[in-house]
Interface confidence: low
């Protein structure tokens, strides 16, 4: 049967017989060995497996030069087989053997779970010599044991190339349950089932699990670890934890918050970055996401105009970056803009609406009835036109841009002139004789330059030719402008 030592506050003196300090007064119990010349080694039986021959820790002495008498078999004495103690306690255990003095240089090593313990372990070997034998006691001590000290410890001794192995000493460090898996925070859909997992280990086993929701126990009947709690669904945020119990006491896991996914809060602080005649760049700060990642956002645009039909333009965009360029807007118009974002649950309310305006646009039509004729006496070209019919959105007319291109013998030169908004005629100096002059005119507002009129060409002859006939823009639908000389 296994000898089992239960926990005490003191370290254990775990070799049988008297303490080393008393060996001087009484050797018999620890060192008495039969010395009869006819001694034959008998089978020994393992304390851990009764009835099975056990020879693993026995060395059969050889015949020596001192004579032919057989020495007894060498074996470690039986000691405590199982030590159970709590974390942070100190423990000391040992193994002992009596070795005939004919053997020299005996050393004992300690092994744990098949690996030799080297270095900074507290192992002490003491020798107690007598006339014929030496008692050897190897002690091993651990201060403030941890769970990692759990395992099977043995002594090994080498004699004459034979290895003698002690019975194992099992160290079991017990403590409060230790979590190997704790519940995790989750964001869940309202009234939808979900699972939480909790796992803890000893020793001592078993470890029983209780679940706690908002400070109240969920299960009055504990479950053996590991435990999976299936929550059928929640309607509001809850905090869950699990309690792990064993014979040593209770450990409580971290509390985890289970959030209920909801529609997001509306975006805040919608800002205008810049606006052009037909676009407005906005940004916003996302609201709280409702415990579910944003999927996309919707920019809603209403024209603020008593005459508009009040319809809302909707532009869908990704949730990030939190910016959007609203396009296809009318020039010089006022708009009310709001932003809403959605997650898997649904759309947020619309942000506070902000007002924004587009700037003036460029004119959409060119000046009309452009005519060009040569005033040879002044050596200039006279240009006339009619003011275009611009829409209000184009803004206030600030002037005209005149393009005149001079082409002669493979050379081409374009010049630009700007004239004020009150003008409907202009004169430009002749740049080249014996050349073609092509004239186009565009209206200009603060919003930009409008389209150029169709080109009107006039031939500038060499000096001495006379021409007073104008060239003009054709009526709509006509072919290319006609050059009149």
């Amino acid at each position: 049967a296994i000898t089992e030592a239960r926990e005490e506050a003191k370290p254990y003196p775990l070799f049988p017989g008297p303490l080393p300090g008393s060996l001087q007064t009484d050797h018999t119990s620890l060192l008495s060995l039969p010395h009869t010349s006819g001694y034959q080694p008998a089978l020994m039986f393992s304390p851990t497996q009764p009835g099975r021959p056990y020879t693993g820790n026995v060395a059969i002495p050889r015949v020596t030069s001192a004579g032919s008498k057989l020495l007894p078999p060498l074996a470690f004495k039986h000691t405590v087989g199982h030590i159970i103690l709590s974390e942070h306690k100190d423990v000391k255990f040992n193994c002992s053997i009596s070795v005939p003095n004919i053997y020299q240089d005996t050393t004992i090593s300690w092994w744990k779970d098949g690996k030799e313990l080297l270095g900074a372990h507290h192992a002490i070997t003491q020798f107690y010599p007598d006339d014929e034998v030496t008692a050897i006691i190897a002690s091993f001590s651990i201060t403030s044991v941890q769970r990692s000290d759990n395992g099977s410890y043995i002594c090994k001794m080498k004699i004459n190339n034979e290895e003698i192995v002690s019975d194992p000493i099992y160290i079991e460090v017990q403590g409060l349950p230790h979590f190997t898996k704790q519940p995790e925070s989750m964001n869940v859909t309202r009234n939808t089932a979900f699972n939480l997992t909790c796992q803890a280990v000893g020793p001592p086993e078993p470890v029983n699990i209780f679940w706690v929701q908002n400070s109240s126990r969920v299960n009055e009947q504990p479950e053996k670890s590991p435990s999976v709690l299936t929550v059928p669904g929640l309607t509001e945020m809850a905090v869950f934890s699990c309690e792990a119990h064993n014979d040593k006491g209770l450990t409580v896991s971290k509390g985890v918050q289970i959030n209920i996914k909801a529609i997001p809060s509306p975006p805040t602080e919608v800002s205008i970055h810049n606006s052009t005649a037909h676009s407005i760049l906005i940004s916003w700060v996302p609201g709280f996401d409702g415990y579910s990642p944003f999927r996309n956002c919707s920019v809603q645009v209403k024209e603020v105009d008593p005459l508009s039909n009040g319809s809302v333009m909707i532009f869908n965009t990704s949730a990030s970056p939190h910016m959007y360029q609203i396009k296809q807007l009318q020039a010089l118009a006022n708009y009310s803009i709001g932003v809403s974002c959605m997650n898997e649950i649904g759309w947020s309310a619309v942000s506070p609406w902000i007002l924004a305006s587009t700037t003036e646009g460029a004119p959409s039509v060119a000046p009309l009835n452009v005519t060009v004729f040569l005033n040879e006496s002044r050596d200039n070209v006279d240009i006339r036109w009619m003011k275009p019919l611009t829409k209000r959105q184009a803004g206030e007319l600030v002037g005209y841009r005149i393009s005149h291109v001079w082409q002669s013998a493979g050379i081409s030169k374009e010049l630009l002139e700007e004239v004020g908004q009150n003008n409907s005629r202009a004169q430009i100096s002749v740049q080249v004789h014996n050349a073609t002059c092509t004239v186009r005119i565009a209206a200009v507002t603060k919003g930009g330059v409008g389209p150029f009129s169709d080109p009107v060409k006039i031939f500038i002859p060499a000096h001495g030719w006379v021409d007073h006939a104008p060239s003009s823009t054709p009526a709509p639908g006509n072919a290319d402008p006609v050059l009149i000389i």
Epitope: T268, E269, I272, S283, V285, F288, D289, P293, M323
Partner: antibody
Framework: QVQLQQPGAELVVPGASVRLSCKAS????????MHWVKQRPGQGLEWIGE????????NYNQKFKDKSTLSLDKSSSTAYMQLSSLTSEDSAVYYC???????????WGQGTTLTVSS | QVVLTQSPAIMSASPGEKVTITCSAS?????MLWFQQKPGTSPKLWIY???NLASGVPARFSGSGSGTSYSLTISRLEAEDAATYYC??????????FGAGTKLELK
């Protein structure tokens, strides 16, 4: 409580690259954008960029677009910023900062002092 | 990008004095944030949405402004207020931009 942990210092040679880390704890990592800010000794603050841990989408200050790369490890709730082709101009304190739902940089790391020197 | 110009760059004031730091934006922004930074420490959010005090900020601080002009005011300066203050905008972004900072010292 919310914490952003950054290594105290990094020393690198010119021309090399470095990856700065920012380990977040005390809140749900994927719910908040992470920003990075540079501060040269005795100077002001410069915004480098931001990254959304839910989908790794990043915005950069154009000035730092070629210099920095933002990334994440969701499993360890850690944000990273890689800085490449380092010069002495990159010697600075680099902060990570959490951005809350309302666009506020509400929690900042202690900053990593990067020294670029041969 | 929006450039934020803080003034003054450095100022010195006595305890009990009223102190105002201004922040001018190169184009209109819809709100302003302010941070406080003391030597060797990270910046701290101090004021957000132009006028709201962050958690733990004493009531002697206030913020105001609109458009391109914003300010941070301390009604009665205390020793612990000595620090560098930065304004920050994110109306026009990216990039987020900061002012160059105002160093407030005690006389």
């Amino acid at each position: 409580q919310v914490q952003l942990q950054q290594p105290g210092a990094e020393l690198v040679v010119p021309g090399a690259s470095v990856r700065l880390s920012c380990k977040a704890s005390g809140y749900t990592f994927i719910n908040y954008w992470m920003h990075w800010v540079k501060q040269r000794p005795g100077q002001g603050l410069e915004w480098i960029g931001e990254i959304d841990p839910s989908d790794s989408y990043a915005n950069y200050n154009q000035k730092f677009k070629d210099k920095s790369t933002l990334s994440l490890d969701k499993s360890s709730s850690t944000a990273y910023m890689q800085l490449s082709s380092l010069t002495s101009e990159d010697s600075a304190v680099y902060y990570c900062a959490r951005c809350d739902y309302y666009g506020r940089l509400d929690y900042w790391g202690q900053g990593t002092t990067l020294t670029v020197s041969s | 990008q929006v450039v934020l110009t803080q003034s003054p760059a450095i100022m010195s004031a006595s305890p009990g004095e009223k102190v105002t730091i201004t922040c001018s934006a190169s184009s209109s922004v819809s709100y302003m944030l302010w941070f406080q930074q003391k030597p060797g420490t990270s910046p701290k959010l101090w004021i957000y949405s132009t006028s709201n005090l962050a958690s733990g900020v004493p009531a002697r601080f206030s913020g105001s402004g609109s458009g391109t002009s914003y300010s941070l005011t301390i009604s009665r300066l205390e020793a612990e207020d000595a620090a560098t203050y930065y304004c920050q905008q994110r109306s026009s972004y990216p990039p987020i931009t900061f002012g160059a900072g105002t160093k407030l010292e005690l006389k």
